[in-house]
Structures are given as structure tokens and as C-alpha cells.
């Protein structure tokens, strides 16, 4: 029978399928970065090349034990995960171990940045097909070392990281914290965040999906046929490379912002029991476990969004947060969101050549998040019309003049800190589609697109009775590429994105306050990528 | 993802007043030193000094160097373990934490960051 | 139900020894480390000694270096305690408790069973 | 003798806050994670807080812990009855390669 993890991530049109690169060969390589390996067990024999690298700290204590079988035990667990024959993801990858922890697992930050030189090496000295990188290790936030995976990234190097085991923010820890890693959480056979004890999994912003990481059968290195049980997100990242290296195989162009956007839209949403985590990072942490994507051929030019948010602002009277999308990624809308509500809203403006979204903290605030709507459009011209504040009582209207550009975002940032004298922006599709309304002493922002083929809607719901939040979906081969919260109450949290769903939070105190005529609306634009059609606002 | 989360950044960026050497007089440093916030994890005594992106590879050499000589003149000696060129210019180097002002000040640093420990997960 | 019991204690002579053994249930035992806590009648806590998840490293007390040994059968989740040479201040509560994780061992315990008495008297 | 100092006792009435220090050196709490723990009358110590901070699950939010440099400080508030017990701290020490605990401090509700 097959082991849970791989039925939760080989989804059963895959399992027999054989993945393979256009030409027959399967040209991708990954890269273990991790205790020494036991290159001979039968698992992984002849799919190992262990290369000479090695640096490792001295193992601590005076009566330290040192045993081959000890000192290959993580490593050769991990490649087993990745590729082995029996309960590998890859069955057939070839992968190259390079020796970062010692027999106790520990490394260190600059053992780990000679080893990722050593790879950028290896790709200057003979260029292969894709690499991914598994970096199954964590240690406190660093900043180099973040910086060392940017560079790497950026070479077209994928790279797959552990969460960490700390059941803590994984912004915390390096390389878990690098936006250009694919950063990988651990569940259970239930679907659930993995418990070590006190410990745990890491969540939070920095995390991208979760991955089985309890109890996974791999390649033990106590004999050459040995097998045993492991668990943490090394065993979750090692089968998100192994999927990674499965895309790869198939589709060897795939580059890291395609992968990792598939991995999220193809991942399963919704299982995981978001209590489990602390209840500032349940909004934050992404309820996405991992399954292998069909092909890029099977599912068409479907147009992809992920939600990225920002670092907290943290409380000072003009905290900004800023969220990024990834270099290859369009920014299609800008959100905010504050806990205590008191926020002056968000813009997109434009930092060294990238729109970047910015949200501002409100005096008396404890502080924003920033949240972005970052999409792939093939060949998208994308750019931001804004209107400054209008006089008192008077409406700010913004849209999308250019030809064929549609509206895929709004934006709104209130001059004025007394969040007394404001309403709420407006979002108008009926007697206005396509445009950003503004009121009283708003700024307003709208992005606007052009790409063959992409259409766009505005769908709003609104709830007049007490409600935490109120939530649009857009329908079936329609993606959410704006969010927004509309009139109602005085307070509201603000919006976000979580998959296709757009989420307007208010704040208790206004569920009380607000009378049945005001109600609130979530706004969602929703978006498709038609190739065959011109761009155009659907009514 | 990119912000500078639990992370401990010292600003060691004092005016040079050493030697009477123009170039180092007139240099005043403005790289910081950053350590990892989980005090058990760190590993004093190995410095990773990460230069400005744009620096060229004899620049990254020259500037190993210069530290070496100038650690020498007090009395210091210090190992250059490593010399990064192929994923950002810097180098490795393991040196008393007394001089961490002194290489702050050397052109061409960004930052030095203490090493620390990383664990298998 | 995460579980450690420790068995073995009782009276004994001094310079005569004694096994202590733990239990442990409830959890992967061979993902953790382990450590023996002792308590002297109305004093403090004090640490005696710690193994890694593997067996694969050891850490002692000064007041037992040489005389203690801690050991661990994964296959049987049991961690044991070998007290030689006993001493009168020796005599304590002596608890078994569990790493908060394997590597990262200087985090404390945060699981401990309900100890057993060793009584050192001629 | 511990290399760990904490006041042998405190006390306050309940619903109040009590603080207890635990004094160390660069080589114990400068440079490890210092952990918490309670030991009521008669039964095995307990983890309150680890990583300097943390609580696992299951203990209330009244238990807090800090660090500053080598001092380490546990707070209780809204004290009740059923907190009256034995706190100690406890820490690795890397110049001794082994982990220390607290003296100890005997919380009293009045």
C-alpha cells in the first residue's frame, strides 16, 4: 500500500505516471544541503553523487559518539523522501549531497553559504538542466544568508527550505525567511501542524504551504535496506522538492514564480485547523497543504494570484508596511489590514522599478500589514492612476483610461487621522464599472492592466446585520485579484485575499454600533486570462 | 518576508580616527554589524564581511587584506578562512571582536554579520 | 498521553549501586533527548545528566562526573540511570524528564515524571 | 551551590502581580534560552515558559518571562491560591557543559 504522505501529495491520476523531460531524459538535479549520506543504501544507490564538500562545525561535548549510521541518519532519510525508489516523490531524480551539518545536525550559517557558492560553482563550471535546492536546516533570521538564496534564485536556481521546528514565526529564522525560497511547513496524517513535543512547526507569513512531515517512511542509515520513521519540516520541504523536481522533469522551463504559484493554486486549501496556531498568525499562515500540479499543458493559460503579505508595521504614529511581489510577478492589487482597525489605508507606489503595496498606520494604532495580490499575467502592461483627495463631501472617482486596460485593483489612503470625520471609500460596479470611488479626504488608487485576453468583474455582498467579517468568492474560472471593504460601519479591519475568497473584517465594537441600514460590502474583482480575447470590463 | 525580523543590528559606525591615514581618517563607517537574536546560536569570533554588491574580485582581495594589515598594526592577527566571489563579494574571517570597528570602517563593507549556528529540522 | 515513569529507586549503602530506569510512552521516543533531575529532601532542583536522541552524546553533573552513567534503549523507550559508588548526598528524588528537542537541548525540560526516592544510609 | 540566584520567597495577595529575578552569568542566562518551571507541594516540577518567553499550551497568559542580560525575570499576574508553589529557572551553562537550575523562590498567596 502506499504510505499517507505520498497519497496526500501524488493525487491518483499521478501515481503510475511516469514524469519525464520532453526529450526522455530526467535532466533535474537537486541538491541536499545536510548531514553526510549513506550513499549506498538501496533506496538511493546510483541516484547519489556525494560530492567532496564539507563544512561542519566540531561536534559538541567531550564523549560525543561519533557513528556513521548517526551521522547519515538525517541526510539520507531526506534522500530517500526526495528520490528513492520506494518511498521517494522523485523516483528517478538524481541528487547531489553536499556535507552542512555535522553527526550532531548542527552547521552553521557560513558552512551553509560555502556550500551554496559551491553550487553556483558547479553551475558556472557546467551548466545542467533545472537544480533545486533542498535546505532541510534553520537557524536564527540572517541576513546574509537570505541574501546568498536571492542570488542564487535569481541564477534560476529553485530553492526549498524547512519552516523550522520551532513552533515560532518562521520570519524568524533564515533561510525560512528568504521570499525567494519556497518555504515549507509540516502536517500530519490529519492534515494538522506537526507537534514535537512543546515544539512544532513553524507558521506564519514566511511560510508558503505545508507538506506531510509526521512520521514519513524513508531510507534509514542503520543498514542498506534499512527503513525508519522521521518527522519535521525537513520531511515536508524534502517532498515539496520532490514535486518540485517532478514540475521540472516535465516541464523543464517552469521558472520559480510558476512553480510556486502552481504549487499553491494545485495545493489542497482549507484542512488544516488554523486554532492550532497562535491567533495573531492564523490570518498570516497559509492553509495550503501540498499535491502534485498537473502539467501546465493539461490546465491552459489559467491566470494565477498568491496573497503576500507584509512584516507588521509595527504601532508608531507614520508605520508603513510594504509587501513585495516577486520580480517575475504583477502586483494586480493593494490591500490593508489592522487589527485595531486604525489604519490610513494603502497605495501602490513604485520602488526601484517594482510597484511595491504600502499600507499606513493610524494614530493610536498598534500597527498594519500590507497585502498584496501578486499574479503571473503573461505579458502584462500594468499601471496605477490616482486621484488626490476631494474636498469634503465631495466623491473621487478613478478608472482605467488607457485602451483595453482593466481595472484589477483599488486602493485608498485617507489624509486625515481622525477616522471619525471619513466614510469608507466605495467601490461602485453598477453605476460606475470599472472605477474606484473615493470619499471624504481619500486618495485613490487603481491598477490597472492590460494583457491579451484578461477580462475583469467586480462582485460585492454585502451584510447589514452583526457580522466579524464578511466574505466574496469569485466563481469558478474567475481569480481574485482585488480585494476591498466597502461603507458600512465606521471601524472596519480591513481586506485581504485568501485563495479565491475576499475577506472583509470589522471590528467588534462597530458589529454593536451599526444600524441595519449600513451595511458592509466586500468588493472583489475577480479576473480571467482568456488568450483568445481582448481585454475588457465584464458588466 | 524581507524585513529584518527578530535581528540584532548594532551600528558600530564610529568616525576613524586611526593612524593618520587619509584614506581611513576621511572614511566614515556606515555598515552595521548584525548578530542572530537567539544568544545561544551565535559563534564569536567568525565575522562574514559582506562588501557593496558592485565590488570587483581584487576589490574583495585588497579588502581582506587591508583588514589583515591593519589588525597586524594592533597587535591583532586574523585568519581569512573564506573569500566569497560567486554568490555576493566577501569574505570569512575569524578575528577578535575588538576589531569589529576597525572593519567596519574598511571601504567597501556593507555589513559584517557574526556566524551562528543552523540546525538540521 | 505523554508518559515517564521511573522505577528503581529504594535504600541502599553507601559506595553500593543502583539502576534507575524511565519509561516513556506517548511520544517518539528516539526524537528527544533526556535528562535525570534529582531533589534533595526540602532543597532545589539539580540536574544530573543529559543524552542526546541518538545516544550519541553524554553530559554529566560535576557531583557525579565518573560515577554516574546515563544510557538509553530507543528499541525499549527506556532511559536508564547507573549510580555507583553512592554517596549519603546522593540520597534525593530522582526525576526523569524530556528534552524539549533533540538538538537544541539547552532549550530545559518540558515533560517529568513522578521521580523515585533513593534513599543512600548505612 | 547554584550558579543560578533567585529570592528565596514573595508573596502578594491574590488578583495581584509578583515578579521573581533569576541572576546569572554571560556563560548561563547571557547566552542560552532560560526556562521556567513550577513545582507545586508534593509533585514533579512543570514547564511554565521556555525560550525565555514561550508558553507551551496549556499554560495561561499570566505567566510571562523576560530577559535582560544576564538576568532573567518571571511575572504571575492575577495571582491565585493555586500558584502558591516552588519557581525555579533553569538554563544551560557552556562553560560548564551542563544545565543549572535556580535556587528556587516560594511563591505565597496572603
Known amino acids: 500500500s502506499i504510505p499517507w504522505n505520498l497519497e496526500r501529495i501524488i493525487p491518483a491520476w499521478h501515481q503510475t505516471e511516469e514524469d519525464r523531460s520532453p526529450d526522455g531524459s530526467s535532466q533535474v538535479e537537486v541538491y541536499l544541503l545536510d548531514t553526510s549520506i549513506q550513499g549506498a543504501h538501496r533506496e538511493i544507490e546510483g541516484r547519489v553523487t556525494i560530492t567532496d564538500f564539507n563544512s561542519v562545525p566540531e561536534e559538541d561535548g567531550t564523549r560525543f559518539h561519533r557513528q556513521a549510521s548517526k551521522c547519515d541518519s538525517h541526510g539520507t532519510h531526506l534522500a530517500g523522501v526526495v528520490s528513492g525508489r520506494d518511498a521517494g516523490v522523485a523516483k528517478g531524480t538524481s541528487l547531489h549531497s553536499l556535507r552542512v551539518l555535522n553527526c550532531q545536525g548542527k552547521g552553521t550559517v557560513s558552512g551553509t553559504l560555502i556550500g551554496l557558492e559551491f553550487i553556483r560553482k558547479s553551475q558556472l563550471i557546467q551548466p545542467s538542466g533545472p537544480l533545486v535546492v533542498l535546505l532541510p536546516l534553520a537557524g536564527g533570521y540572517s541576513r546574509i544568508l537570505n541574501a546568498a538564496c536571492r542570488h542564487l534564485a535569481r541564477t534560476g536556481v529553485v530553492l526549498v527550505a524547512a519552516a523550522g521546528n520551532f513552533r515560532d514565526d518562521a520570519c524568524l529564522y533564515s533561510p525560512a525567511s528568504a521570499p525567494e525560497v519556497i518555504t515549507v511547513g509540516a502536517t500530519n496524517a490529519q492534515d494538522q501542524p506537526v507537534t514535537l513535543g512543546t515544539l512544532g512547526t513553524n507558521f506564519g507569513r514566511c511560510v508558503d504551504l505545508f507538506a506531510p512531515g509526521k512520521d514519513i517512511i524513508g531510507a534509514s542509515s542503520d543498514c542498506s535496506t534499512c527503513f525508519m520513521s522521521q518527522s519535521g519540516t525537513s520531511q515536508a520541504a524534502a517532498h515539496v522538492a520532490g514535486i518540485v523536481a517532478r514540475m521540472l522533469s516535465r516541464e523543464p522551463t517552469l521558472t520559480l514564480a510558476e512553480l510556486r504559484q502552481r504549487l499553491i493554486h494545485f495545493s489542497t486549501k482549507d484542512v488544516i485547523n488554523m486554532a492550532w496556531f497562535p491567533e495573531d498568525q492564523q490570518v498570516l499562515t497559509p492553509n495550503l497543504v501540498a499535491t502534485l500540479p498537473p502539467s501546465t499543458h493539461e490546465t491552459g493559460g489559467q491566470l494565477l494570484c498568491r496573497t503576500v503579505w507584509s512584516a507588521h508595521s509595527g504601532p508608531t504614529r507614520t508605520a508603513t508596511a510594504t509587501a513585495r511581489c516577486a520580480p517575475e510577478e504583477e502586483l494586480l492589487s493593494c490591500s490593508s489590514f489592522s487589527r485595531s482597525g486604525r489604519r490610513r489605508g494603502d497605495w501602490i507606489e513604485a520602488i526601484g522599478g517594482q510597484q511595491v503595496c504600502k499600507a499606513l498606520n493610524a494614530f493610536g494604532g498598534e500597527g498594519v500589514y500590507a497585502v498584496a495580490r501578486c499574479c503571473l499575467v503573461p505579458r502584462a502592461n500594468c499601471s496605477i492612476h490616482n486621484t488626490p483627495a476631494a474636498r469634503a463631501g465631495l466623491e473621487t472617482h478613478v478608472h482605467c483610461h488607457q485602451k483595453d486596460h482593466v481595472l484589477t485593483g483599488c486602493s485608498f489612503h485617507w489624509e486625515v487621522e481622525d477616522l471619525s470625520v471619513r466614510r469608507q471609500p466605495a467601490l461602485r460596479s453598477r453605476r460606475q464599472p470599472g472605477q474606484c470611488v473615493g470619499h471624504q479626504a481619500a486618495s485613490v488608487y487603481a491598477s490597472c492592466c492590460h494583457a491579451p485576453g484578461l477580462e475583469c468583474k467586480i462582485k460585492e455582498h454585502g451584510i447589514s446585520g452583526p457580522s466579524e467579517q464578511v466574505t466574496v468568492a469569485c466563481e469558478a474560472g474567475w481569480t481574485l485579484t482585488g480585494c476591498n471593504v466597502l461603507p458600512g460601519a465606521s471601524l472596519t479591519l480591513g481586506a485581504y485575499s485568501v485563495d479565491n475568497l475576499c475577506v472583509a473584517r470589522v471590528h467588534d465594537t462597530a458589529r454593536a454600533d451599526r444600524t441595519s441600514g449600513e451595511a458592509t460590502v466586500a468588493a472583489a474583482i475577480c479576473c480571467r486570462s482568456r488568450p483568445s480575447a481582448k481585454a475588457s470590463w465584464v458588466q | 518576508q524581507d524585513e529584518d525580523g527578530d535581528y540584532e543590528e548594532l551600528m558600530l559606525a564610529l568616525p576613524s580616527q586611526e593612524d593618520g591615514l587619509a584614506d581611513e581618517a576621511a572614511h566614515v563607517a556606515t555598515a552595521t554589524f548584525r548578530r542572530c537574536s537567539k544568544e545561544a546560536w551565535r559563534l564569536p569570533g567568525t565575522y562574514i564581511v559582506v562588501l557593496m554588491e558592485e565590488t570587483q574580485r581584487l576589490q574583495i582581495e585588497q579588502t581582506a587584506h587591508r583588514l589583515q594589515t591593519r589588525a597586524a598594526r594592533r597587535g591583532y592577527v586574523i585568519k581569512v578562512l573564506h573569500i566569497f566571489y560567486d554568490l555576493f563579494p566577501g569574505f570569512l574571517v575569524k578575528m577578535s571582536s575588538d576589531l569589529l570597528g576597525l572593519a567596519l570602517k574598511l571601504p567597501h563593507v556593507e555589513y559584517i554579520e557574526e556566524d551562528s549556528f543552523v540546525f538540521a529540522q | 498521553q505523554v508518559h515517564l515513569v521511573e522505577s528503581g529507586g529504594g535504600v541502599v549503602q553507601p559506595g553500593r549501586s543502583l539502576r534507575l530506569s524511565c519509561a516513556a510512552s506517548?511520544?517518539?521516543?528516539?526524537?528527544?533527548?533526556m535528562h535525570w533531575v534529582r531533589q534533595a529532601p526540602g532543597k532545589g532542583l539539580e540536574w544530573v545528566a543529559l543524552i542526546w536522541s541518538d545516544g550519541s552524546d553524554e553530559y554529566y553533573a560535576d557531583s557525579v562526573k565518573g560515577r554516574f552513567t546515563i544510557s538509553r534503549d530507543n528499541s525499549k523507550n527506556t532511559l536508564y540511570l547507573q549510580m555507583n559508588s553512592l554517596r549519603a548526598e546522593d540520597t534525593a528524588v530522582y526525576y526523569c524528564a524530556r528534552a524539549i528537542a533533540a538538538l537544541y537541548y539547552y532549550y530545559g525540560m518540558d515533560v517529568w515524571g513522578q521521580g523515585t526516592t533513593v534513599t543512600v544510609s548505612s | 551551590q547554584s550558579v543560578l540566584t533567585q529570592p528565596p520567597s514573595v508573596s502578594a495577595a491574590p488578583g495581584q502581580k509578583v515578579t521573581i529575578s533569576c541572576s546569572g552569568s554571560?556563560?548561563?542566562?547571557?547566552?542560552?534560552?532560560v526556562s521556567w518551571y513550577q513545582q507545586l507541594p508534593g509533585t514533579a516540577p512543570k514547564l511554565l515558559i521556555y525560550?525565555?518567553?514561550k508558553r507551551p499550551s496549556g499554560i495561561p497568559d499570566r505567566f510571562s518571562g523576560s530577559k535582560s542580560g544576564t538576568s532573567a525575570t518571571l511575572g504571575i499576574t492575577g495571582l491565585q491560591t493555586g500558584d502558591e508553589a516552588d519557581y525555579y529557572c533553569?538554563?544551560?551553562?557552556?562553560?560548564?557543559?551542563?544545565?543549572?537550575f535556580g535556587t528556587g523562590t516560594r511563591v505565597t498567596v496572603l
Open positions: 525560550d525565555y518567553n
Open positions: 533553569g538554563t544551560w551553562d557552556s562553560s560548564l557543559s551542563a544545565y543549572v
Open positions: 506517548g511520544f517518539t521516543f528516539n526524537s528527544f533527548g
Open positions: 554571560s556563560s548561563n542566562i547571557g547566552n542560552n534560552f
